[in-house]
């Protein structure tokens, strides 16, 4: 083993903050992978690891791509997977993960399942069904075209399965209330029996949620099949089509036939022999747990090992079981001693987010985003444009029961979708989608509902109300809202789209392109009013001057948020003004700023954080 210039932490109770997430894995899986990675080192050295929720943490964990705020840009897919800094203050001790990688558990993309009999467990790839091996979801054994997978290695033995994300179970966004596609459907007089991009210029696949789009105008977007989206070949980004014909033979899953290198591929049309369209199937990805355990070794002070079997050896290889080699253990114990852990429980499971003791000051550059880089736009022929970028979760209500050898055909009961109202009590909401002062009342939006809070004695909280009843054009999930204090027009943002309400009249959705914001701006975090019909528009750590009348940003005005508002979280997800103060929300917390709202005047003495508090307790005045 080697240590890093003798650097180590001077305390044994190490704290960490997961600053942002990759979209490759569900958040709880990412949380768990990091907790397990720390636990590896806690098993063999007298170290404890506690998750905290702010940049005062010893180890700040960040996903980023390319240039991501330090002097060491990432290099795209493969190559450099992550990097970490030796122990110390500031960026020292931090661990950064390249989000151009496919992060997995080391065994392929993680696909959540729906219904079936596995309680949402992810697909297990590869899995065996009727003696054949599958590395992606399949429709084999079904007559309704709904893709499914086994959630264990052997369906034949265990019978455990679930349905994969599919337009036959649900759609996303649009105005079809999440209902599944209806096939065939009519669009512009033509019949479609699969999702289509027709009528759209952005490549988003959509379908009608009734049999006739022309008549009913109800639609949704088809879920992405991550397990079957190809890379490389001549069809990158397209979906595998199963079954497909190759050299006269039918294939229902990815194959390495016809290749000397063993790489799995598929056709992206039903017949490779005639169309020659193909791509590589998603690879196994990199185990976030293993890479994190290696990086955390660095963050604790270990340099690379020359022992090929050691976790700290500089080359990635997937392995199962406890990852530390004697060399790794010798190294960490050299730094921190052999003593037993003070607490034998898993180290990283603090569930409550403590109030930050001081406003964060760290402002790395913009992290990767969960949204598509180019937002959907209305197609020339009138195909609908999408709603928000995060999908509604309710799906079919009836879970099918498994058959003896193959998963069952989905019954018609699966098509119904209930919109469930949230708990009446907004104090139970962890993170609101958007908060805005509208007509003198603070509005709290969440999942298609909102509450109104009037800060008067004896005037209780009102709601929940259905957002779509008050503002019918809006999608269920919002990123931010803003009322122009002069005209009283209300601006709503969701994904790459904006709606502007004047009373009950709506203009929109309008693409952010029309505002002068490029495709890298995937959502708007909020607006703060300036005088003379101007506002500041925020997105992912950057701020533009915005003309409320022309609804255009000044592209030359863009600066980093910390240049104008020091001490606020760089990745605030919601920003609004209330009672002449600016609020920057991150997670459960807000950072309040005394805001100088004169146009073209920035008083850096004034734009300072003057309070940090809880959204629920301090703004909503929850008990």
């Amino acid at each position: 083993f080697q240590t890093f210039k003798g650097l180590k932490w001077d305390h044994h109770n190490i704290t960490y903050w997961i600053q942002n997430y990759s979209e490759d894995l569900p958040r709880d899986m990412i949380d768990d992978a990091f907790a397990r990675a720390f636990a590896v080192w806690g098993e063999v050295a007298p170290l404890t690891f506690t998750r905290v929720y702010g940049p005062e943490a010893d180890i700040v964990i960040q996903f980023g791509v390319a240039e991501h705020g330090d002097g060491y840009p990432f290099d795209g897919k493969d190559g450099l997977l992550a990097h970490a800094f030796p122990p110390g203050a500031g960026v020292q001790g931090d661990a950064h993960f390249d989000d151009d990688e496919l992060w997995s558990l080391g065994k392929g993309v993680v696909i959540p399942t729906y219904y079936g009999n596995s309680n949402g467990a992810p697909c297990h790839f590869p899995f065996t069904f009727e003696g054949r091996s599958y590395s992606a979801c399949t429709t084999d054994g079904r007559n309704d075209g709904t893709p499914w997978c086994s959630t264990t290695a052997d369906y034949d033995k265990d019978g455990k399965f679930g349905f994969c994300p599919s337009e036959r179970l649900y759609t996303e966004h649009g105005n079809g209330e999440g209902k599944p596609c209806v096939f065939p459907f009519i669009f512009e007089g033509r019949s479609y029996s699969a999702c289509t991009t027709k009528g759209r210029s952005d490549g988003y696949r959509w379908c009608a949620t009734t049999a006739n789009y022309d008549q009913d105008k109800l639609y949704g977007f088809c879920p992405t099949r991550v397990d079957a989206t190809v890379v490389g070949g001549n069809s990158a980004g397209e979906l595998c089509v199963f079954p497909f014909v190759f050299l006269g033979k039918q294939y229902s899953s990815c194959t390495s036939d016809g290749r000397r290198d063993g790489r799995l591929w598929c056709a992206t049309t039903s017949n490779f022999d005639t169309d020659k369209k193909w791509g590589f199937c998603p690879d196994q990805g990199y185990s976030l747990f293993l890479v994190a355990a290696h990086e955390f070794g660095h963050a604790l002070g270990l340099d690379h090992s020359s022992v090929p079997e050691a976790l700290m050896y500089p080359l990635y290889s997937y392995l199962e079981g406890f990852p530390l080699n004697k060399d790794d253990i010798d190294g960490i114990q050299y730094l921190y001693g052999r003593g037993s852990k003070p607490d034998p429980r898993p180290p990283a499971t603090t569930t409550t987010e403590p109030q930050p003791t001081a406003p964060p000051t760290m402002c790395p550059t913009i992290p990767p985003t969960a949204y598509p880089t180019v937002g959907p736009t209305v197609g020339p022929t009138g195909a609908p444009s999408p709603g928000p970028t995060s999908s509604p979760s309710p799906g079919p209500t009836g879970a099918p029961s498994p058959g003896p050898t193959a998963p069952p055909t989905a019954g018609s009961s699966e098509a119904s979708t209930e919109s469930l109202s949230p708990a009446d009590n907004p104090c139970n909401v962890d993170v609101f989608d958007a908060i805005a002062e509208i007509q003198g009342a603070l509005h709290f939006f969440k999942d298609g509902w909102y509450w109104k809070f009037l800060n008067h004695r004896g005037s209780p909280l009102q709601g929940p109300f259905l957002t779509a009843r008050t503002w019918p054009a809006l999608p269920a999930t919002l990123d931010s809202a803003f009322e122009d204090p002069q005209t009283k027009r209300v601006f709503f943002f969701s994904g790459r789209q904006m709606w502007v309400y004047t009373g009950k009249t709506v203009l929109g959705p309008r693409s952010l392109d029309k505002l002068g914001l490029g495709p890298e701006v995937t959502h708007v975090s909020g607006l703060l009013p300036r005088r003379l019909g101007k506002a500041l528009l925020f997105s992912k750590g950057r701020v533009w001057r915005f003309d409320l009348k022309s609804q255009k940003v000044d592209p030359q005005s863009v600066i980093r948020v910390d240049k104008e508002f020091s001490g606020v979280p760089w990745n605030s997800h919601d920003i609004f003004q209330y009672q002449d103060k600016a609020y920057f929300c991150h997670g459960k917390f807000f950072w309040r700023v005394s805001f100088q709202n004169e146009v073209n005047k920035v008083d850096h003495e004034v734009n300072q954080v003057d309070d940090v508090g809880y959204v629920t307790y301090d703004l909503l005045q929850c008990p």
Partner: antibody, heavy 123, light 107 residues
Framework: EVQLLESGGGLVQPGGSLRLSCAAS???????DMWWVRQAPGKGLEWVS????????FYADSVKGRFTISRDNSKNTLYLQMNSLRAEDTAVYYC?????????????????WGQGTLVTVSS | EIVLTQSPATLSLSPGERATLSCRAS??????LAWYQQKPGQAPRLLIY???YRATGIPARFSGSGSGTDFTLTISSLEPEDFAVYYC?????????FGQGTRLEIK
Amino acid sequence: EVQLLESGGGLVQPGGSLRLSCAASGFTFSQYDMWWVRQAPGKGLEWVSVIYPSGTTFYADSVKGRFTISRDNSKNTLYLQMNSLRAEDTAVYYCAKDRAYGDYVGWNGFDYWGQGTLVTVSS
Amino acid sequence: EIVLTQSPATLSLSPGERATLSCRASQSISSFLAWYQQKPGQAPRLLIYDASYRATGIPARFSGSGSGTDFTLTISSLEPEDFAVYYCQQRGNWPITFGQGTRLEIK
């Protein structure tokens, strides 16, 4: 012993092209980030480009779109293809080896440099 | 990009004296700073990496200190061969940048 040896410099007219090479020996070339840094006559140092072991490249704004860095790990050689050369590209061009290695950030600095090769852009 | 400002531009000292060279960053770069020495007609040579660590083969009279925005290269007792141009270089943020240099000349 680590050695870096540049070649390929010379006199070229504005708009012309040159290809610089840097032959490396004495270390595992394929594992390190490799850099080109230049120094105009009587001036300070300016980074030009870097290439990672994976082949990923980055360029200074002043050369973006005109210069291309590449490496041949089998030949332990670093290259810089310079097109559309301008008078302000006149400089001694050094190749340099990064002290850092892999994913452990902090060994900051270029621990070995070539002797440099002079590129003169003039009509 | 981060601007590194070196001072003084020129420092005139005699052998045996102590030299103190300064490098200031326009924003915090933690300890991601290196110092180089360059003699006429030669390539730069790495002296100090990560603000305070001496590179291989560098005499003990060279030392580096500082963190954040203010950094210092100290030569405790100047030898004749130390008269050269000294550059600082940061990698606390992208892109990397160099200071404009301090010329250390014999008084």
